[in-house]
């Protein structure tokens, strides 16, 4: 029999996924002015583009890049120099060290003399001219010009003890989400930086096996829940005369300094005005403090009437992080996202006090990010359109008008293809790029900031489109289910020839961490796409209580009781899926990574009999083992007079007995700096003590991402075998 033309498409293979055959591209302009940007071409030339004159030329050739094996670059604002970054060496999630070379564009040669030390932990240009600030061996250095000798700003830096201008582990991962902790003032006169003192923080130590006769020990100051935290101080130095006065400390608001606290972010407002955000250790009170430079005192003053308090009464302050302010041209008033009276995160305008904040957006949806505030417009993203929490559209509010008029810039551009956008704006939003992530193929476009007209397609993933033509992709549905007054959004990935009258195995993929979102209208070809395409497995992702962008009632439901509702809601969803009639009740599995590994473990141990098997990769097993900033944000402190009882009740180990009737695969990297191997070691110990059989796999010297090519291939192959065996699918 000759196959019909319609069936010439092939299913995805695991190899396709592991090789990244169907990965997509995005295009983010590296803006250097109102109408100019740089971009690294396919062949690694750095190309300059002027939108208005339409000129483009190579500003830095690939041969220059190659001469020092550079993988990244940065143009100085005066356009005289470029730094070239090479020898990239990853440290934690955001941090890395590298070697930096300075290339003089005028002379067409590398700057010689007073070359930069190596490896450097962070380097950046001043916003004006070509001053350089960099961090080397935990100290900050300044160069007035690339060829000048460096001036050492700090001397206190010490490995694993004191960090200047770069965060320690916990601040990097859980507070700043950056590799740096220094910020130039807009005119390049001042440099603000944070000093983190980790001297009293307990150390996590783990073996790194490498190839040597003896393993190395990795030591990281890592405060777990309830432990001593870093001590933070913020300083500002005048970079014009750094030797005259030295760094000036910025005072901490009184109401914050009275107990343990965190620094959360710094925003320069103008050349002599800075805004600092602080957070109490019990993270339901945040204080935004606006400080001014007093020339007469040579000090920074933060008046009490310029302190703005943000407090949550139902949970923690902010979303995952406390939002940052977007200041107006007047350098006094600002726009900020925080919860309104109904518990939905919305844009508010603060002129004098937070009490008198004027709400700019409202509704049973959430404003997510303020991209840019200009003289007459405010650009932001939200999930308002058509009531889908997992979409992101870009809106413009005309702030000159009263009441402000709102326009959705993206809602109807490519409605079927594009429902999840981000944006990148030129300095004053004269132009902007839109990057659409799906649900169709990602596409990046350039737009006029005044008319919103599309000027140019920057990247439309044509090659990917062509290569997917002969692939049988699964069908993706995003819908909601209701249960007892609660609404749960889910994404279901259905095998290509899906037939409702048949029965399919079901795999739940879960993350479920506070303020996360899994059900998003984005394009993806990954492991679960393969499982649906080739193995005929129905995949479902469900956003239960505790997940983001659906209001505080839903988000804060998990406050102080992690591990309860997240699990309950996955179980509720599975029961609803069974009721749909096409799920084989005997073949249901769940898997997750990190927080998802925690939830999948607890779901397997729920004693409901819903799951035949499941996988936990790098799971948290007790919130006492995880980072203070994260654990305490959602759980309070593990003390008798606070929330110790739930810390103890919510461990995976406490449910060891309940794993008896499920097939459990536990996986962890031994060099996980984030969720320590300790978590899985303790699960394994509890299961052994309970005489419960289970499967396990460790990945030597792999971190939380288990991302080395070999390890990743092994991991997904191993999990595939496990699942196919569980679902009785032939190899």
């Amino acid at each position: 029999l000759r196959p019909s033309r319609g069936n010439t498409k092939r299913a995805l293979t695991l190899k396709d996924i592991l090789n990244g055959t169907f990965s997509y591209k995005t295009y983010f302009p590296n803006w250097i002015s109102e109408q100019e940007y740089l971009h690294q071409s396919e062949d690694d030339n750095i190309v300059f583009y002027n939108i208005e004159t339409r000129e483009s030329y190579i500003i830095l050739s690939n041969s220059t890049m190659k001469s020092v094996n550079a993988t990244d670059y940065g143009l100085s604002p005066d356009r005289q120099f470029v730094y070239l970054e090479s020898d990239y060496s990853k440290l934690w999630r955001y941090s890395y060290t590298a070697t930096y070379y300075i290339y003089d564009l005028q002379n067409g040669e590398f700057v010689r003399g007073y070359e930069l030390p190596r490896p450097i932990q962070y380097l950046c240009w001043s916003p004006v001219g070509s001053k350089l600030a960099y961090v080397y061996q935990n100290n900050i250095y300044l160069k007035q010009r690339p060829g000048d000798p460096p001036f050492q700003i700090t001397y206190t830096g010490r490995e694993n003890r004191i960090f200047n201008g770069i965060p320690d582990w916990v601040y990097e991962e859980e507070m700043l989400a950056t590799k740096y902790a220094l910020w130039w003032s807009p005119d390049g006169k001042f440099l603000a930086y944070v000093e983190f003192n980790d001297s009293d923080i307990p150390i996590i130590a783990y073996s790194y096996y490498g190839d040597g006769q003896y393993p190395r020990t990795i030591n990281i100051p890592y405060p777990k829940a309830g432990a001593k935290n870093p001590v933070v101080r913020v300083f500002i130095v005048d970079t014009t005369y750094p030797h005259h006065v030295g760094p000036m400390e910025v005072p901490v608001p009184e109401m914050i300094a009275s107990s343990d606290y965190y620094f959360s972010w710094l925003t320069w407002v103008s050349s002599e005005r800075v805004c600092l955000q602080w957070l109490k250790r019990v993270q339901n009170v945040s204080v935004l403090s606006i400080c001014d430079f007093r020339e007469d005192w040579h000090a920074w003053e933060c008046p009490k009437n310029q302190e703005h308090v943000e407090e949550s009464r139902t949970g923690w302050a902010g979303g995952f992080f406390v939002s940052t302010p977007a200041f107006s041209q007047d350098a006094t008033s600002y726009y900020k996202i925080f919860s309104d009276k109904d518990g939905y995160k919305h844009i508010h305008y603060i002129k004098d006090t937070v009490e008198n904040a004027i709400q700019i957006t409202s509704g049973k949806w959430e404003a997510i990010y303020i991209f840019r505030v200009t003289q007459d417009s405010l650009f932001y993203s939200s999930n308002e359109f058509e009531g889908y929490p997992g979409r992101r559209n870009i809106y413009r509010i005309s702030i000159g008008n009263s009441p402000p008029s709102k326009k959705c810039v993206t809602c109807h551009l490519r409605k079927e293809r594009c429902q999840y956008y981000t944006a990148s704006f030129s300095y004053k939003a004269k132009y902007y790029a839109l990057v659409c992530y799906g649900p169709g193929l990602p596409i990046s476009t350039l737009h006029d900031g005044r008319t919103d007209q599309e000027i140019q397609v920057l990247e439309e993933n044509k090659e990917l489109e062509n290569s997917l033509r002969n692939i049988q992709l699964p069908k993706v549905e995003i819908k909601k289910l209701k249960d007892g007054g609660l609404t749960f959004w889910y994404k279901m990935i259905l095998p290509p020839q899906f037939d409702r009258s048949k029965k399919y195995p079901l795999l739940i993929q879960v993350y479920g961490g506070p303020c996360s979102q899994s059900v998003k209208s984005v394009f993806a070809v990954n492991w679960i796409t393969y499982l649906a395409s080739k193995e005929g497995i129905v995949i479902a992702l469900v956003d239960g209580r505790g997940t983001a962008f659906q209001g505080d009632k839903f988000l804060h439901a998990v406050y102080r009781k992690l591990g309860v509702y997240e699990v309950e809601d996955q179980l509720t969803a599975v029961r609803k899926f069974i009721e749909m009639g096409f799920i084989d009740e005997e073949r249901i599995a769940i898997w997750g990574w990190s927080y998802g590994g925690y939830v999948s473990s607890l779901a397997l141990a729920s004693g409901t009999g819903l799951f035949k098997c499941g996988i936990a990769v790098a799971p948290v097993s007790s919130w006492e083992y995880y980072a203070s900033i994260y654990s305490e944000r959602f759980m309070g402190l593990p003390t008798k007079d606070d929330n110790l009882e739930h810390y103890k009740n919510s461990t995976v180990m406490a449910r060891a007995e309940y794993f008896r009737n499920v097939d459990y695969l536990l996986i962890h990297g031994t060099a996980d700096d984030n969720v320590h191997f300790q978590n899985s070691a303790q699960i394994a110990k509890a299961l052994v003590n309970a005489q419960v059989d289970f499967q396990a796999m460790w990945y030597s010297d792999q971190n939380h991402g288990i991302s080395s090519g070999r390890s990743q291939n092994h991991l997904y192959t191993h999990m595939t075998h496990f699942l196919k065996q569980c679902f009785s699918l032939s190899d």
Epitope: R313, K341, D342, G343, H346, E355, I358, Q359, S362
Partner: antibody, heavy 119, light 109 residues
């Protein structure tokens, strides 16, 4: 100065309807949440209804749900309370009040208007 | 629904004396509590918000304290114009219903 002036009170029979108005001045009306609070003769204060400034979400006390409707007209800077199926227990002075923007306490109150429901 | 209980129902004091009014919540309301003053034939007037912050133009003889379930309004030295009824109100959730206490009447002894 913030001013709130209620009107529309009077005497009605049980089952009848009445609409109260509140004219607001001295602040940007559309930016603020507003509410109605009542006080029966010789009794304490009872929150009746509220309306958000942005979005216009409305809220009601259980005792009036389904019978009363709160609304606002920002072009006229006026707040309304449409009261249907009135009962004797609705007899009270009705105060219009301006809520604080961040928290639901009442920063400014009108002088009130008396509604008497009697057969 | 959060119930607020005010005590005493009536407080008989002389001008110049100190008045201490209590408001108890049936469950914790954090510091989200306001106090109002109402004189006969007049509308209520905001005195204190967030348990302890004085509203605009309120004399400093009025002070509020407490958090959780126990709150106090103190008038340090009663002036003749302070004899009135005082109400507390919680706004813990900002989600209705908003509730008031039954009131405390401060009368001249």
């Amino acid at each position: 100065d913030v001013q709130l002036v209620e009107s529309g009170g009077g005497v009605v029979r049980p089952g009848e309807s009445l609409t109260l108005s509140c004219a607001a001045s001295g602040f940007t009306f559309s930016n603020y949440d507003m509410g109605w609070v009542r006080q029966a003769p010789g009794e304490g204060l009872e929150w009746v209804s509220g309306i958000r400034g942005r979005g216009g979400s409305t809220y009601y006390a259980d005792s009036v749900k389904g019978r009363f409707t709160i609304s606002r007209d920002s072009s006229k800077n006026t707040l309304y309370l449409q009261m249907n199926s009135l009962r004797a227990e609705d007899t009270a002075v009705y105060y219009c009040a301006k809520e604080n923007n961040r928290h639901s306490f009442f920063e400014y109150w009108g002088l009130g208007t008396l509604v008497t429901v009697s057969s | 629904e959060i119930v607020l209980t005010q005590s005493p129902g009536t407080l008989s004091l002389s001008p110049g004396e100190r008045a201490t009014l209590s408001c108890r919540a049936s469950q914790s309301v954090g510091h989200y509590l306001a106090w109002y003053q109402q004189k006969p034939g007049q509308a209520p007037r905001l005195l204190i918000y967030d348990a302890s912050n004085r509203a605009i133009d309120i004399p400093d003889r009025f002070s509020g304290s407490g958090s959780g379930t126990e709150f106090t309004l103190t008038i340090s030295r009663l002036e003749p114009e302070d004899f009135a009824v005082y109400y507390c109100q919680q706004y813990y959730n900002n989600w209705p219903p908003l509730t008031f206490g039954g009131g405390t009447k401060v009368e001249i002894k």
